[in-house]
Interface confidence: low
């Protein structure tokens, strides 16, 4: 019989490569290679016959997740050697191009290219708050689907999101990426009580999140490097800016902060009054 049987399944292409060291028996006519699902499992039995000078062959369309017995026989005329055999379970292909889109404070959109395999019956999406190890959300989509929106998430949290390829009776290794939901910004920026060196800034806090604080940054429009920063209690939604320059336009931004995460800033401009003569 041949020796050193080696089996290699490519999960991306579904191709099984069978290789061996050629028999030392003289004048052989070739090799017969069979792949058969073990233990009476449902699946195709395949066979190839190759020339004596070949030491490998390939099989397409093996069912991932199914165990196959692979045997190689030396053939001489109408006689066969005892086979050299091994088993292999072709892996279920996993996604390679998972990406995130349309991230908000409560949702994360997923995109991927559906895998081209008739054995795939769908994908399982699992969401875990980073570091918890416990799935907080799980859903299933059909094999033709290449998008999903995970909703009902909390703002400013890192989530580990996994997509697993499903076949009948098996699944792939997970493709996992981590993404943080956004911290919602404040809204409705207003300026009141404008004086030559002061102004009152108010805003509406975002709903449904217990913030750590607000960050208020302000600087003259013509000198934005000269920025001052104030940290405001999350229970406050106003601040009075003092020691401003008269008759000067200021750019003011207010950001929400949740733990170490900052929202996109809410920006506005306001000019201070002129000094009375």
């Amino acid at each position: 019989p041949p020796t050193n049987l080696h089996l290699e399944a490519n999960p991306d292409t579904g191709v099984l490569t069978v290789s061996w060291e050629r028999s030392t028996t003289p004048d052989i006519t070739g090799y017969r290679i069979t792949t058969t699902p073990t233990n009476g499992q449902q699946g195709n039995s395949l066979e190839e016959v190759v020339h004596a000078d070949q030491s490998s062959c390939t099989f397409d369309n093996l069912s991932p997740g199914l165990e196959y017995n692979v045997s190689v026989y030396t053939v001489k005329d109408d006689k066969e050697s005892v086979p050299i055999s091994d088993t292999i379970i072709p892996e279920v292909p996993q996604l390679t191009d998972l990406s995130f889109v349309d991230i908000t404070d409560s949702s994360i959109g997923l995109r991927w290219t559906p895998l081209n395999s008739s054995t795939i019956i769908g994908y399982r999406i699992t969401v875990v708050a980073a570091g918890e190890g416990i799935p907080i959300f799980e859903d299933f989509v059909d094999s033709s689907v290449g998008y999903y929106t995970v909703t009902g998430l909390e703002p400013g949290i890192d989530y580990d999101i996994s997509v697993i390829t499903l076949i009948n009776g098996g699944e792939s290794a997970p493709t996992t990426l981590t993404q943080q939901t956004a911290v919602p910004p404040p809204t409705d920026l207003r300026f009141t009580n404008i004086g030559p060196d002061t102004m009152r800034v108010t805003w509406a806090p975002p709903p449904s999140i217990d913030l750590t604080n607000f960050l208020v940054r302000y600087s003259p429009v013509k000198n934005e490097e000269d920025v001052a920063e104030l940290s405001i209690s999350p229970s406050d939604n106003a601040v009075v800016l003092t020691n401003l320059l008269p008759g000067t336009e200021y750019v003011v931004s207010v950001s929400s902060v949740y733990e170490q995460h900052e929202s996109t800033p809410l920006r506005g401009r306001q000019k201070t009054g002129l000094d009375s003569p």
Epitope: I134, I136, F140, V141, V145, Y147, T149, G152, L153
Partner: antibody, heavy 115, light 113 residues
């Protein structure tokens, strides 16, 4: 305001059909996995069916498989449950529920009586 | 018979602490899935009370708390009040490939004496 409102319940004879509707407002129905859950008189909650968010995959409890069909019309932001071959044991209040981290929003329920 | 097991009823005087247990198996709670709790006041729809084992949605009083260990979970109500008289249900996803299954406990009636 985020809200679910069911309708379509009523009295029906065994073997008959009903279609329940669940109108969603304040959020986009297609972004969420949506469920039907029922509660027989004096009994506990029983999961009936699910339609997945994003994908349109559907799942059913064994007790209703082959008789009930869950669907949704994204343009109307409405979830449906088509119930055929109804039996006395299907008598219950039927709730639609949105699945976020849990069933975070429930409708008020619609009563189905099979008699 | 429900997949998750809860006591049919518990009771307590106002101000007391009561706990409701929810026992599952390695196919649901023990598989690492979250447990959620729902409150159903008489004649109304269920309402989410605790999600992800121990988290309270906004608007739920902090006298309600949840915990989970192994294949079981529990809901505690401290400082019991008359308006807490209701049915309480635990829930968890269920391992069942491509089934989307969700299982509930049989419910526990809380009576305020």
């Amino acid at each position: 305001e985020v809200q679910l409102v069911e309708s379509g319940g009523g009295l029906v004879q065994p073997g008959g059909s009903l279609r329940l509707s669940c109108a969603a407002s304040g959020f986009t129905l297609s972004s969420y996995a949506m469920h039907w859950v029922r509660q027989a008189p004096g009994k506990g909650l029983e999961w009936v069916s699910t339609i997945s968010g994003g994908g349109g995959s559907t799942y059913y409890a064994d007790s209703v498989k082959g008789r009930f069909t869950i669907s949704r019309d994204n343009s109307k932001n409405t979830l449906y449950l088509q119930m055929n071959s109804l039996r006395a044991e299907d008598t219950a209040v039927y709730y639609c529920a949105r699945r976020g981290r849990a069933f975070d929003i429930w409708g008020q329920g619609t009563t189905v009586t099979v008699s | 018979q429900s997949v998750l097991t809860q006591p049919p009823s518990v009771s307590g005087a106002p101000g007391q602490r009561v706990t409701i247990s929810c026992t599952g198996s390695s196919s649901n709670i023990g598989a690492g899935y979250d447990v959620h709790w729902y409150q159903q006041l008489p004649g109304t729809a269920p309402k989410l009370l605790i999600y992800g084992n121990s988290n309270r949605p906004s608007g739920v009083p902090d006298r309600f708390s949840g915990s989970k260990s192994g294949t079981s979970a529990s809901l505690a109500i401290t400082g019991l009040q008359a308006e807490d008289e209701a049915d309480y249900y635990c829930s968890s996803p269920m391992i069942s490939s491509l089934s989307g299954h969700v299982v509930f406990g049989g419910g526990t009636k809380v009576t305020v004496l």
